[in-house]
């Protein structure tokens, strides 16, 4: 507990102090006081530097004194032989004696009293920034007019903080400007503009005079600008050392003016204004900005339009342009959007054709469609080459975005038929010689495939069975072979409107307009054993002349069998119609004169007994195309005959091309259109 005074005596005082003793006293007086310690008696063994016995006075870490020997007062009016004055309120006294004393020493007597200290004058460091006032046991600081004492109760400063400037234009100066600014002050000014405006500070060099930096370059008084995480300054010296125009890129600016105790100058004056926040003119590849300006500021809106072949992809939606707004933070909205090359995507597949997997599907890439040759060709031209266009579509120079269409090649057998002598008088044939040949099992008959969806046959074949089962692709017609071939399912049968339907078809004598079309449910896949025959053209080139040769094929009656198991074929010449009229009907169902002969019929045969017969009906009479010798067209359809092995009558297909085309067009699926 601190005391105001006290007495300290060496051990056994006034008797001789013992050897080998060490004793210490901790003196403490109240805060705000110093200590006056004085000795009235001192008798301690003398030694050099008081090495043997001593009394030591310590203040903090400092040894104030070390005493030994005998002392007497110099002043007859005062008993004090030694004294110490410390401005601190704590002191330590330590007495030490060694192992022997040559004489008898009595030690010491000392007293301490608390003394007032003058904090205003007694210390090197002045405790108050301005006025210091001492009193017994303490001191207090005070300030000149217009200054106030800070919370530390030592420093005075001016009340220059707390101002908030919100106007878009203004002027700020240091306190008392242009008179010297207050020392020991921290002035903070806040500029707060609405979002979207940046604070721009302008100064003139001559409007700035602040205490210069020390030798290390540190400002003693300083002016600092803080905008978010950016700092400008500190600035000091005579004449403004920084940029005279500071664009802060922020709508909030803090101005901090810090001064020390010395060296006041006239200070500073600045102007500020709010600029709409600028947004950088960014380099956005593959695009153009509208409007084009040298500088863009807050609330400016630009339309960024992608160059041809580029698009902006947001989610799953592709667009060719987007809008971007200069925002209050100086950044563009939609800045993540970029003009990327248009991606046309994986090209659509096409029926009966293919497209190689493209290396790239981006703008400018090229792909090539091909048809499954030699069975299909590209009907709608264009060469099959498509490039990825700017609108994201695969585009062909001729067709535009329309896909190529692979349609069956007609009239080209994979293997040409080599005539052999055995149909009637015909030869064995392979389905590859007549890939258009269709087999009808009920009634046992034939037909000709003319495209993916249509079979041409004789009307008398389908008049009694409107849901015929048909097969393609097989040379032989045993059940097991047909099971391995392609069965065709009819969707609808179209009999020529000129064909007269009879209640008793067996007694028919009029085979005029003996033609029908069968629409298939599903398209036929073409290949070496299945391929259509061409239709005749409408020009006079397709008018048959006597002696023109044609091929017939079928599984009809032969010399040895009622029905052939393996496909038979023969080459026959066209004959004058009268040749057919002259042949006696084998098993007439009516008077010979009742049989009708019309220009819709072709007469053929009569050579080497080669002829079609029962079971061959509906099959094609195939003639070489006069304009393309590699192709065959269906000039006729096996219709009827007076007698097998002589002449036969065939429906003249050329006369029905318009009806065939019209029927097919009116009954095509949308996919075919």
């Amino acid at each position: 507990e601190p005391t105001m005074y006290g007495e300290i005596l060496s051990p056994n005082y006034p008797q001789a102090y013992p050897s080998e003793v060490e004793k210490s006293w901790d003196i403490e007086v109240p805060e705000g006081y110093g200590i006056h310690l004085y000795f009235t008696h001192l008798d301690i063994e003398l030694s050099e530097n008081c090495a043997y016995d001593s009394v030591q006075i310590i203040s903090g870490d400092t040894e104030e004194g070390r005493l030994c020997g005998q002392r007497s007062s110099n002043n007859p009016h005062s008993p004090i032989v030694e004294e110490f004055q410390v401005p601190y309120n704590k002191l330590q006294v330590i007495f030490k004696s060694d192992f022997s004393n040559e004489e008898r020493f009595t030690g010491f007597a000392a007293y301490y009293v608390a003394t007032d200290i003058n904090e205003c004058t007694d210390f090197v460091d002045v405790p108050c920034s301005h006025f210091c006032n001492n009193f017994i046991g303490g001191y207090f600081c005070s300030c000149p007019p217009e200054y106030f004492l800070h919370d530390d109760m030592k420093n005075c400063g001016v009340n220059c903080s707390g101002d908030v400037f919100t106007a878009l234009i203004g002027e700020i100066a240091s306190p008392n400007y242009p008179k010297p600014y207050p020392e020991n002050s921290r002035c903070e000014y806040q500029i707060r503009l609405e979002k979207g405006f940046q604070v721009v500070v302008t100064l003139r060099r001559e409007d700035f005079d602040v205490e210069a930096a020390d030798s290390a370059g540190n400002c003693l008084d300083s002016l600092v600008f803080v905008a978010g995480d950016r700092q400008f300054g500190p600035y000091c010296g005579h004449g403004f050392p920084g940029p005279l125009n500071i664009e802060t890129k922020s709508n909030a600016l803090d101005i901090i003016f810090q001064t020390d105790l010395t060296g006041q100058k006239k200070g500073w004056k600045l102007r500020y204004h709010g600029d709409p926040m600028p947004c950088p003119k960014e380099d956005t590849p593959n695009s153009v900005w509208e409007p084009a300006k040298a500088k863009y500021v807050f609330r400016d809106v630009v339309q960024i339009t992608c160059l041809d072949g580029f698009e902006v992809v947001e989610g799953r939606v592709g667009a060719t342009s987007f809008y971007s707004t200069c925002q209050s933070n100086g950044k563009w909205s939609n800045s993540k959007l970029k003009c990327q090359p248009v991606d046309c995507g994986i090209p659509e597949s096409i029926e009966n054709g293919k497209v190689e997997d493209p290396e790239s599907t981006l703008f400018g890439s090229v792909i090539r469609y091909t048809c499954e040759e030699p069975y299909y060709y590209m009907e709608n031209g264009g060469g099959g080459e498509y490039h990825c266009a700017g609108n994201g579509s695969w585009v062909n120079e001729v067709l535009g975005p329309e896909l190529p269409k692979c349609v069956p090649v007609c009239g080209v057998p994979r293997e040409p038929f080599e005539e052999k002598q055995r149909i009637i008088g015909g030869s064995d044939a392979d389905i590859k010689n007549f890939p258009w040949q269709v087999f009808f099992d009920n009634p046992w008959a034939g037909g000709a495939l003319i495209n993916e969806y249509w079979v041409l046959t004789a009307a008398h074949v389908v008049e009694g069975n409107r849901e015929p089962t048909m097969y393609v692709g097989s040379t032989s017609v045993q059940t097991s072979r047909l099971a391995k071939s392609k069965m065709l399912t009819p969707e609808h049968v179209f009999i020529h409107p000129g064909w007269k339907l009879l209640e008793v078809p067996e007694g028919r004598t009029n085979f005029d307009n003996d033609i029908a079309l069968v629409r298939l449910k599903d398209p036929v896949k073409m290949g070496p054993t299945v391929s259509p025959i061409c239709l005749p053209g409408t020009s006079s080139d397709y008018n048959l002349m006597d002696g023109d040769l044609g091929l017939i094929s079928g599984w009809g009656r032969t010399e040895k069998r009622d029905r052939a198991v393996r496909l038979k074929a023969a080459r026959l010449p066209v004959a004058p119609l009268r040749k057919c009229k002259e042949v006696k009907v084998e098993k007439p169902t009516a008077d010979a004169e009742a049989y009708v002969f019309t220009p819709n019929m072709i007469c053929a045969g009569g050579e080497k007994g080669m002829d079609s017969c029962k079971g061959d009906s509906g099959g094609a009479f195939a003639v070489q195309d006069p304009n393309d010798k590699t192709k065959f067209y269906a000039a006729g359809l096996v219709s009827w005959g007076p007698q097998c092995g002589t002449y036969g009558l065939y429906t003249r297909v050329k006369n029905y091309v318009d009806w065939i085309m019209k029927t097919m067009q009116e009954n095509s699926t949308p996919r075919e259109d």
Epitope: K420, D428, D430, Q478, A564, K568
Partner: antibody, heavy 118, light 107 residues
Framework: QVQLVESGGGLVKPGGSLRLSCAAS????????MSWIRQAPGKGLEWVSY????????YYADSVKGRFTISRDNAKNSLYLQMNSLRAEDTAVYYC???????????WGQGTLVTVSS | DIQMTQSPSSLSASVGDRVTITCQAS??????LNWYQQKPGKAPKLLIY???NLETGVPSRFSGSGSGTDFTFTISSLQPEDIATYYC?????????FGGGTKVEIK
């Protein structure tokens, strides 16, 4: 008159190869489908292979598939049977036959004996 | 594969006798059946096609019938020159298969 003459038979070790030939005369060879039929000693007939007129279509019995190859040369009026990887069970008289029409063999050769033995 | 079962495997009959051989297919073969005659040491000879049609030049004492799976070959009056082995053959599907044969002898 129609004649079919087989040749090329003989003794061969298992795993060996032989090529049989059939020379046709007296008819237009290219008009007809042709077949090979074999008959093991004291056994019945076994159809081996068949070829179409142009040679584009061929069929084989399961027992010879992958080992035997039928071919024809219409210009030379000849039918062939290349036999590889022969086994003891391939020992037989091999006949070539003309397929008159619809799988009926109307003309046959006299046959050639193939013996597979070590 | 279609199996052809022929019976009997052999028979002995007198000259002038009616001889009947049967052939059964393991599945329906319609009328796609031939009958062949093979005399000892000779190549086979076609007698019947399409189950019932007589090949040109074949004596009329030979006949065939049947459809589907069951077929019959008949020699109406056995002659000494008819001594041979008779085979049926199906051509409904590949592989073409023969019956095991019926050996006909004269008593």
């Amino acid at each position: 008159q129609v004649q079919l003459v087989e040749s090329g038979g003989g003794l061969v070790k298992p795993g060996g190869s032989l090529r049989l030939s059939c020379a046709a005369s007296g008819f237009t060879f290219s008009d007809y489908y042709m077949s090979w039929i074999r008959q093991a000693p004291g056994k019945g007939l076994e159809w081996v292979s068949y070829i179409s007129r142009s040679g584009s279509t061929k069929y084989y019995a399961d027992s010879v598939k992958g080992r035997f190859t039928i071919s024809r040369d219409n210009a030379k009026n000849s039918l062939y049977l290349q036999m590889n990887s022969l086994r003891a069970e391939d020992t037989a008289v091999y006949y070539c036959a003309r397929d008159e029409t619809d799988y009926a063999f109307d003309e046959w050769g006299q046959g050639t004996l193939v013996t597979v033995s070590s | 594969d279609i199996q052809m079962t022929q019976s009997p495997s052999s028979l002995s009959a007198s000259v002038g006798d009616r001889v009947t051989i049967t052939c059964q297919a393991s599945q329906d073969i319609s009328n796609y059946l031939n009958w062949y005659q093979q005399k000892p040491g000779k190549a086979p000879k076609l007698l019947i096609y399409d189950a019932s049609n007589l090949e040109t030049g074949v004596p009329s004492r030979f006949s065939g019938s049947g459809s589907g799976t069951d077929f019959t070959f008949t020699i109406s009056s056995l002659q000494p020159e008819d001594i041979a082995t008779y085979y049926c053959k199906q051509y409904e599907d590949y592989p073409l298969t023969f019956g095991g044969g019926t050996k006909v002898e004269i008593k």
